[in-house]
Every structure is written in C-alpha cells, then in structure tokens.
C-alpha cells in the first residue's frame, strides 16, 4: 500500500494509472466503500462522500490513462485509505494528513516560549524535527517547545514531520517582538534637552497598543507615571502627561520622548512598557538619565552627578590640559581655592569619558597690602 503525507490546508494529488493509455472508467472510493468520484465517459461524477465539494480530478490526463484524485483544503480527518478502481484492478493509497500550529500566534514577545503542536491522525506515530533560521535542529513528539525567544530567533523555522519513512515539511515564519535595546543610558549636563528613543526591532503592517513611561527619580521615594499614550496603526497619541516634567512625544514611530531640560530632580531610571493588541505580556525598555552639574560657590568648585551610575565610574575635576586635581569613585568632588582657568568635570568609565561639563574660574584680584 502506497503512503502519501499531506499538510492540513494544502492540496494533495493521489495518482492512479491504468495500463491502457486512454480514457476508461474509474472510481475513487474511501475505506468505507463510499464513492468519492469517477467518470461517465468524459464527464466527472461525484459520490455522496464528505469530500464532495473538495474532491476533483484532472480530465486532461484521462486520455493518457491517468486518473488522479485531487483533495483540496486538506483536513486531518481526510486521513484514510483511498481506493482507485480501474480495469478490474484496485490501487490503494493511504493518506495521512498532518497539521503543525504555533501555540498562539507566530508573533511572540521576546522572552516568551514558542510551542509547536502537531495534529496527526489516530494510529499514526510521527516524529517532528524543527530547524531554526540558523540551522539548529530541535526534535519533539506531539509538541515541541522553544523557550526564551530572542530577536535573532525571528525568521523561517522549517519543521519536518516523519512517518513511515516519508516526510512532509512545514514552514513557519516567526517574528519576535521587542525593542532594539533592552536598556539605554543618557548622560546630560544640567539644563540640556534630553532625547529618549525607543526603536522597535520589528516591522508589522499594523501596530496597535498602549504604553506608559514610569519614572523613578533618584531623589523621589516612589515612582510616578510620566506619560501614557496610545498607538494606532503606527500613529502615536498622548493620553496623559505629568505637568512636571512636561514631556513631549513624537507622533510617529520610533517612539520618541523629549524632556525640555535635564535637572537633578529628574535623574533616575524609567521603564517604558508597550502592551500590543491581542498579545499577552508587554514589551519593556529601561532608560536611565544621569545629570551633571558643575558649580562655583565662593572658594569652592564642585562637580556632582545624579542618577544611576555604576560604582566603577570615576568623577574628576581637572584644569584644562593638566592632570586631574581630584578623581574619585563618588558622586560629588570639589576643589577648594581653584586656580583661574577653564575647569573640566569628567565622568568616565575605564578612561572613556561619558559626560563632560566645563566651568570657567575667574582670577580673584586681591588688593596689595601697602607698606
């Protein structure tokens, strides 16, 4: 008995060949002996089977002694033994129809799991092996799970179902939804305008959802919502925004926020969440703001930073083109009685300057003492 594997939703063509290369009478029946289709001269006739509206043949091949049964939009329950009766002969073909579906949707959030479930006819014992876009093979039984999806898992996954040494291949396009960066940090001098950008790492035709930026200022005891917004077909509309700070938001993707001024009271960490329509879970991006201020009060030159700095970061005060006068792994440094000239306050990580603020110290003219 010949075995043919089919894919749910696809079309299959079961072959039946007579020894005479001419149009003769034939019938296709199922295992219950119910007629599916046949011919009467050059006319196609159909029986009372449940395949009625999905079964067909190729009349153009009958003259060559070929009498195929074509079944469209295959269903798992179409799995059966089909019998072709021609020239007092019976040809049997066993059709096994398989389906492979993703747990929810093929658009998944970063960190979620992809579960592929194999639908198979009763009595079959298939094995399934999926190949990632980069060629990593994962084997499974009726279900196959891939955990902790990341952006780079996006692409075409090719799954092969093996049964009776025959195979059928499914291609599933997976899109992992995430922001391009999990976290970002912005370093600004006090008073500068701050730009926060949240680019997405995927493109889809229609993107609808809602989002919010929660902010935990270093100086504040609790976090607060700075802005909430809606996303409709890639258009951004602000729903609610705090009065302090008065954030502005771009109307188009990528999501873009502007803080008019970097101030010490705004330094801290934010979490932008984006809930997409018809998706469980949310996309997250962390954003951090570090603010620097250099001031001179009487005989004291001070440099301070606010916000989430690593303990390895170095804060230094130096006179231009000279060695650092003071350099500490702290959030504030100062110099008493600084020399006149252009002073630089530097925040650096392993020698790499992250933030720099210049302040000019004017000479102090002392009145000479008369003899």
């Amino acid at each position: 008995k010949k075995v043919v594997l089919g894919k749910k939703g696809d079309t299959v063509e079961l072959t039946c060949t007579a020894s005479q290369k001419k149009s003769i009478q034939f019938h296709w029946k199922n295992s219950n002996q119910i007629k599916i289709l046949g011919n009467q001269g050059s006319f196609l006739t159909k029986g009372p089977s449940k395949l009625n509206d999905r079964a067909d043949s190729r009349r153009s091949l009958w003259d060559q002694g070929n009498f195929p049964l074509i079944i469209k939009n295959l269903k798992i329950e179409d799995s059966d033994t089909y019998i072709c009766e021609v020239e007092d002969q019976k040809e049997e073909v066993q059709l096994l129809v398989f389906g492979l579906t993703a747990n929810s949707d093929t658009h998944l959030l970063q960190g979620q799991s992809l579960t592929l479930t194999l639908e198979s006819p009763p009595g079959s014992s298939p094995s399934v092996q999926c190949r990632s876009p980069r060629g990593k093979n994962i084997q499974g039984g009726k279900t196959l799970s891939v955990s902790q999806l990341e952006l780079q898992d996006s692409g075409t996954w090719t799954c092969t179902v093996l049964q009776n040494q025959k195979k059928v291949e499914f291609k599933i396009d997976i899109v992992v939804l995430a922001f391009q960066k999990a976290s970002s940090i912005v370093y600004k001098k006090e008073g500068e305008q701050v730009e926060f950008s949240f680019p997405l790492a995927f493109t889809v035709e229609k993107l609808t959802g809602s989002g919010e930026l929660w902010w935990q200022a270093e100086r504040a005891s609790s976090s607060k919502s700075w802005i909430t917004f809606d996303l409709k077909n890639k258009e951004v509309s602000v729903k609610r925004v705090t009065q302090d700070p008065k954030l502005q938001m771009g109307k188009k993707l990528p999501l873009h926020l502007t803080l008019p001024q970097a101030l010490p009271q705004y330094a801290g960490s934010g979490n932008l969440t984006l809930a997409l329509e018809a998706k469980t879970g949310k996309l997250h991006q962390e954003v951090n703001l570090v603010v620097m201020r250099a001031t001179q009060l009487q005989k004291n030159l001070t440099c301070e930073v606010w916000g989430p700095t690593s303990p390895k970061l170095m804060l230094s005060l130096k006179l231009e083109n000279k060695e650092a006068k003071v350099s500490k792994r702290e959030k504030a440094v100062w110099v008493l009685n600084p020399e006149a000239g252009m002073w630089q306050c530097l925040l650096s990580d392993s020698g790499q300057v992250l933030l720099e603020s210049n302040i000019k110290v004017l000479p102090t003219w002392s009145t000479p003492v008369q003899p």
Epitope: G140, S145, V146, L151, Q152
Partner: antibody, heavy 120, light 111 residues
Amino acid sequence: EVKLQQSGTELMKPGASVKISCKATGYTFSSYWIEWIKQRPGRGLEWIGEILPGSGSTNYNEEFTGRATFTADTFSNTAYMQLSSLTSEDSAVYYCARSVSASNWYFDVWGAGTTVTVSS
Amino acid sequence: DIVMTQSPASLAVSLGQRATISCRASQSVSTSSYSYMHWYQQKPGQPPKFLIKYASNLESGVPARFSGSGSGTDFTLNIHPVEEEDTATYYCQHSWEIPPTFGGGTKLEIK
C-alpha cells in the same frame, strides 16, 4: 548563581571511551542547551555539539558524529558526553557551556573544564 | 565550515592605550538586521568568558572599555583603555550555521 560543575581529570588508553559529566545549578536545566567544546593545548576552541536536556534534542559537529554521544539526566540536572575510540588527538580540555539562545550558538556560562589525556 | 581568521596572533599594548583585534569570516555572517558574531576572553588556566554577542552587544558585567563592531565578514574587538587585567587570549566565534567555529585567538599582553 548559574554554575556548571565538571567531573575531574581522566587518563585514558587509546581505543577506550571516556564519559564526562557537567552538573548545572542556578537555572532551569531542561530549557537551555548544553554545549560541548574541545580545547587542545596551545590550540583554539572547537565545538563538538549540544544537547537540549528537556527534549533530548542533539546537534553534532560532523567531525565528531559517531564518536561523541550526549545524554542528559533532568532529575540530577547533569549532562554527559561520551567520547569513544580515543586517540592521542583527543587529549584536550573539554568544556561544557550553556547556550541561552533558542536557535543560535553563544555560550554565556562555562564549566571549569575536564582534562582528558590519552596515552598508552 | 566557515573559517574564522584572527589577527594579529599576538599583540602588546601599553597600559591605557587601545587594543584592536580583528576577525575575518570566510563568508558573510550577517543579515540586514544582525551579525552572528560573538567574542570571548580566556585567561590562562581558566575557561573562556563571554564578552560580546551579535557583534556589538556587551554582556552584562563586562566593562564599557570593551566594544565590538563590524558586519559581513570583518569584525573588530576594541579595548580602550587597556588595563593590566585584560591580559588574556581573545576569541571570536560565529553562529551563522552548524558548526559554529572559533577564531584561532589573539594573545593580548599589556606593556
């Protein structure tokens, strides 16, 4: 803390087989691939293959197909590599490593290595 | 298999200066979106340590003086400014296909 603890040094005869273990702690063992990597003295690193403990899925470098066999015990959170028909070319440090990627290969946590010496 | 070629084989850099290590793949290991290239550091008697994934993404806990760049077939690992503790052998590795392969390594010495 994620850790991979490997079995100790092995001194083997040519033609013999060696089985190295790698015990994982600090994460869900069944969900992440365990990779096996070879490093010969003064030489570079060579990927042998991998196993996904939850499903038993394996992928091998063709160079090692037929000689390397990976298994995993999800009760003890331990992965094993057996290498057969040993020759002096197999004298090396063998590392197990974790790959957090579902469809890719990069290795974020490594065991300390198991030294295998093949000598008659 | 994709062959990864690292240069130079060894490198001596003064403390505080920049170290540049190159890695060339025998075929492109990038799509329009990502480069499937990763970097590791190995100190004598220790296993390799993961530094950078997908050409430029620093693994958490890795100092900002390490940076990666490149696409297609040519990739670079930069360390600036180098510190005493950076004395090690550095390896690149592609994950474009099976089998993933490593470069021969670049030994960095601090003067």
